[in-house]
């Protein structure tokens, strides 16, 4: 039939593995009159032949390393040898097999590396070549260090890039290599083809001798530089040196400062270029880089640390132009009025920033001077002599001297005398009633306004009201914001409400002042209010315990076996009904109540594993909301597929009469899983009666050779039955038939008078 093996003359491409003895024709070209024969030209290498009737074949094994692509041309000729069709290009792509071992270019390599070289930076390359195709695993090389000598504490100091053969230091090697301790190392390197992934890969080894040299590219000690230096700049502060002359040095400011006050010269000397200000920046960390003439870094950058030493060049500063404190009438002696906190930009916890406080003036001095005192080091103001009266003096102004060891600064404090806090906040309502909200009400929503009043002096800490929820909201779902002008409280939602955990909350508010109440006055029931928050249910879909459920069973489990289960819960506590969706193969059923999943048909790994279906959980009753999860059933292989021939072997032939016993190669396969080593088939003749004429011998786990035992065969077709056993558990056997024709040949092909197109043999032996 036309198609895979025969057809009209047209450009075509065929792929053939190298190294295989010919076992099949490549193609049968069909001629259209007046064409009667075909001509093959191009890169035939006397391997490719086209027989008069258009049978294209090859007569010996190909070698990809000799020629990876054979560019051929086929023309159809008439009976006078004149081209009547074509020529058309026929491309034979020779597919690679692993028939070449990798070879190192040198049996010994030598190199040197400096201690502390950057990890991962190659200092030596080993190189191997493999004639096989680098686009296939056969030519993909994998380098490995077999041994490092000496090996200290079982730590590898060297590493190799598996693909490029680049040898570099590991992090440990970069840190620990020391020529004083060990000046030389030896590595044995292996290279494997097949990307190093196959036990059938070829390999080679080489030896690498490595000398470790000293590294003077080291970070200098941290530098201390006094701020505001008046010496002429630039000033050399430290230095770095590369191991060899000719390096180009530069500094890298990782912080991207607007002003970077350091430079480096081409000797590696580092300078500060202008006076530093500790209060602007107290430490600098930057990097010194050494590059080669092409601008490529020679090694890792060195970290340079510069600490700026403080001098006392900053006076204390006041927190604000005037600091305001309040004090109630009749407050007792020693009560704290407030703390004045001044600042000094000089270095903390040093004499340069250690501050002293002293009151230098009080106005008015009524009823006397010295009413207040300030703690010398803490800055805390206290009532010193007597209680104050608002009607006599409602406001005092203090001038306070704040000093460090060299500078003095004056700060101003205003002390307002306010009413005593003898009035408590009183709620307008003690019960704000019930409020019903859906559980999905937005966060940030204001749900209630509350109001308390306080008769103390307005706009003082005695009359300011702060609201707190003291009961009924342990989860902190609510909060209260206060308007400072009106003391109105706005109750807002801070966290989502939840019907399932708190359907009803009895909330209690307390109203308080920031100022303490006077002695003898206490908050009472008037400062408390309540309200009841009722949260209504919003129906939510069931929730699966997992996004994906996974189970693993053998593909041969009995019908009705439980293969897995799923679980979901409904937030409202409704019952759940489970169902399956997407069970395209009809393999499974689910228990609607329990979520258990059972097989209802034979499973088959070869049809596809894992088998993916969706599970649906639906509320029973309510609004029948549902959610979906995945169930993945991983099928473990059992040996349930007998071996078979890997391809169609019709058209095998031997030329009659046989001049010597002949043989042909065939390949078997099966659809089961073959981990790691692949199939291990055994081959034998399918019936005893064949033993006189044929024998079958195993080549490897998948290929066998069928050979004739003698040469006395008739000119006809023989059907040879082959028994192939897969050696599995249980072992399965397939009986396959190989039809072999014995026919008269012309130039190695079955001869047929021209015009006869039936029964085309396709493989010559």
């Amino acid at each position: 039939q036309e198609g895979k093996f025969s057809g009209p003359l047209k450009p075509m491409t065929f792929s053939i593995y190298e190294g295989q003895e010919p076992s099949q024709i490549i193609f049968q070209f069909k001629a259209n009159p007046p064409a009667v024969t075909f001509e093959l030209t191009g890169e035939t290498d006397n391997i490719f032949v086209i027989e008069r009737e258009g049978l294209l074949y090859y007569n010996r094994a190909l070698d990809r390393e000799t020629r990876s692509t054979h560019n051929l041309q086929v023309a159809a000729l008439d009976a006078n040898g004149i081209i009547v069709e074509g020529p058309v290009p026929i491309t034979i792509k020779v597919k690679d097999i692993n028939d070449n071992r990798p070879t190192f270019l040198q049996s010994k390599y030598e190199g040197s590396v400096r201690q502390n070289s950057r990890p991962g930076k190659p200092f030596l390359y080993v190189n191997a070549t493999d004639l096989d195709d680098p686009a296939t695993p056969n030519g993909q090389l994998y380098y490995q260090i077999v041994i490092q000598l000496p090996m200290i504490n079982n730590v590898m100091y060297f590493q190799i890039n598996n693909k490029t053969g680049a040898i570099s230091l590991t992090r440990e090697g970069s840190q620990e290599l020391n020529p004083a301790k060990n000046p030389s190392y030896n590595l044995v390197i292996s290279v494997k083809d097949m990307g190093g992934q196959s036990e059938n890969s070829f390999s080679d080894t080489t030896s690498v001798d490595i000398i470790v040299t000293e590294n003077i590219w080291k970070a200098p000690k941290p530098v201390e530089m006094v701020e505001n230096s008046t010496d002429p700049h630039p000033i050399k502060i430290t230095q770095v040196r590369w191991n060899d002359p000719g390096a180009q040095y530069s500094l890298v400011d990782k912080e991207k400062l607007p002003r970077f006050p350091f430079s480096i010269d081409q000797e590696g000397d580092i300078y500060v270029t202008q006076p530093l200000d500790r209060e602007e920046k107290d430490a600098y960390v930057f990097y010194a880089v050494a590059k080669d003439e092409y601008g490529k870094p020679l090694s890792y950058p060195l970290e340079i640390h510069v600490k700026v030493k403080d001098i006392n060049d900053n006076p204390p500063t006041c927190p604000s132009p005037v600091t305001v404190f309040e004090v109630q009438e009749n407050e007792r002696l020693g009560n704290s009025i407030g703390t004045l906190t001044a600042h000094d930009r000089d270095e903390e916890n040093t004499a340069n920033s250690f501050l002293n406080y002293r009151i230098v003036e009080q106005t008015p001095k009524l009823p006397m001077d010295g009413l207040f005192l300030i703690q010398t080091y803490a800055g805390m103001l206290q009532l010193a002599k007597q209680s104050l009266k608002k009607q006599d003096t409602p406001q005092y102004n203090l001038t306070i001297e704040v000093s460090d060891k060299d500078f003095k600064t004056l700060c101003f404090v205003q002390i307002n005398v306010i009413d005593i806090n003898d009035q408590i906040p009183i709620f307008e309502k003690s019960d704000y009633g019930n409020l019903t909200l859906a559980e999905d009400t937005n966060i940030g929503s204001t749900i209630l306004t509350i109001q308390a009043t306080d008769a103390d002096e307005p706009f003082t800490g005695s009359s300011k009201i702060l609201y707190h929820i003291i009961k009924g909201d342990s989860e902190g779902r609510l909060g209260v914001d206060t308007d400072p002008h009106t003391n109105t409280g706005y109750v807002i939602i801070k966290k989502p409400l939840d019907f399932e955990t708190a359907a009803v909350s009895n909330i209690v508010f307390k109203a308080e002042n920031p100022e303490p109440l006077v002695f003898g006055v206490k908050y009472n029931a008037s400062s408390f209010a309540k309200f009841t928050l009722i949260v209504t249910d919003v129906n939510e879909a069931p929730q699966f315990s997992q996004h994906v459920f996974q189970a693993k069973v053998s593909e041969d489990v009995a019908i009705g076996t439980k293969v897995g289960n799923v679980t979901a819960k409904d937030p409202e506590g409704l019952d759940i009904s489970y169902s399956l969706r997407g069970d395209t193969r009809g393999w499974l059923k689910i228990d609607h109540v329990t979520g258990e999943i059972f097989s209802v048909a034979p499973l088959d790994r070869e049809a596809g594993s894992p088998y993916r279906v969706q599970v649906v959980a639906t509320e029973v009753g309510g609004s029948s909301l549902s959610s979906v999860s995945e169930f993945h059933l991983i099928l473990m292989d059992v040996n349930d597929n007998p071996p078979r021939l890997a391809k169609d072997y019709t058209g095998l032939f031997f030329c009659h009469p046989l001049s010597a016993p002949g043989s042909l190669i065939f390949e078997a396969t099966d659809d089961d899983q073959h981990l790691f080593r692949g199939p291990h088939f055994t081959f034998s003749l399918g019936s005893g009666s064949l033993q006189n004429d044929w024998e079958v011998s195993k080549i490897n786990g998948t290929h066998a050779r069928l050979s004739t035992r003698h040469t006395e065969f008739e000119e006809r077709e023989y059907v040879v039955l082959i028994r192939i056993n897969d050696g599995g558990r249980p072992p399965l056997e397939g009986i396959v038939s190989l039809p072999v024709t014995f026919c008269s040949c012309v130039e190695g092909s079955c001869f047929r008078p021209a015009g006869h197109q039936t029964g085309i043999p396709t493989v010559g032996m």
Partner: antibody, heavy 119, light 112 residues
Framework: QVQLVQSGAEVKKPGASVKVSCKAS????????IHWMRQRPGQGLEWIGY????????KYNEKFKDRATLTADTSTSTAYMELRSLRSDDTAVYYC????????????WGQGTTVTVSS | DIVMTQSPLSLPVTPGEPASISCRSS???????????LYWFLQKPGQSPQVLIY???NLASGVPDRFSGSGSGTDFTLKISRVEAEDVGVYYC?????????FGQGTKLEIK
């Protein structure tokens, strides 16, 4: 041995037809093509056409396409060339020749047939 | 059609001397298979033609080896290393790369 034997000389009047035969022997007649050429007095050779006896396929020189017919009888291994509407300038020696399949050259020629066209 | 041009048209030669006949085609006769489709034959007086050289340089069976053919895609030469009396006749070149087959005018070799 391989031989091509042509029919005898012919004298024809203008407007008539002539049919020259070429009998092959010593090989399988259907394996090779038979070509016809002519040589006019004192002139070079002209190719008339060929026939492939295996399937009867023919090809003609455009110049002779309308007047020449090539046929073959495989039972007698004989090829024929008929030329119609003869003119005086068709006077020539007509040759058949075997074109050797696979080697692609004229290896055997007939002895030639003289056709004279005269009123 | 491909035009074949021979020269000289007449060639008188002394026996024992070499002879050379040239043939030129209007199109290259070299095909991608490496073969050049040029044919040389001889027509002795009163005889039918007989093959000498096929595919430009191949000596036909039974032809004396004093005959040889050579050339490029369009320029061809037939050489006789030592002419003998029996070599007289008209020598033709012919192309069979494509239809119609075409012939040179012929070169008449005669003995001086």
């Amino acid at each position: 041995q391989v031989q091509l034997v042509q029919s005898g000389a012919e004298v024809k009047k203008p407007g008539a037809s002539v049919k020259v035969s070429c009998k092959a022997s010593g090989y399988t007649f259907t394996d090779h093509t038979i070509h016809w050429m002519r040589q006019r007095p004192g002139q070079g050779l002209e190719w008339i056409g060929y026939i492939y006896p295996r399937d009867g396929y023919t090809k003609y020189n455009e110049k002779f396409k309308d007047r020449a017919t090539l046929t073959a009888d495989t039972s007698t291994s004989t090829a024929y060339m008929e030329l119609r509407s003869l003119r005086s300038d068709d006077t020539a020696v007509y040759y058949c020749a075997r074109f050797y399949y696979g080697y692609w050259y004229f290896d055997v020629w007939g002895q030639g047939t003289t056709v004279t066209v005269s009123s | 059609d491909i035009v074949m041009t021979q020269s000289p048209l007449s060639l008188p030669v002394t026996p024992g001397e070499p002879a050379s006949i040239s043939c030129r085609s209007s199109k290259s006769l070299l095909r991608s298979n490496g073969n050049t489709y040029l044919y040389w034959f001889l027509q002795k007086p009163g005889q039918s033609p007989q093959v000498l050289i096929y595919r430009m340089s191949n000596l036909a069976s039974g032809v004396p080896d004093r005959f040889s053919g050579s050339g490029s895609g369009t320029d061809f030469t037939l050489k006789i290393s030592r002419v003998e009396a029996e070599d007289v006749g008209v020598y033709y070149c012919m192309q069979h790369l494509e239809y119609p087959f075409t012939f040179g005018q012929g070169t008449k070799l005669e003995i001086k």
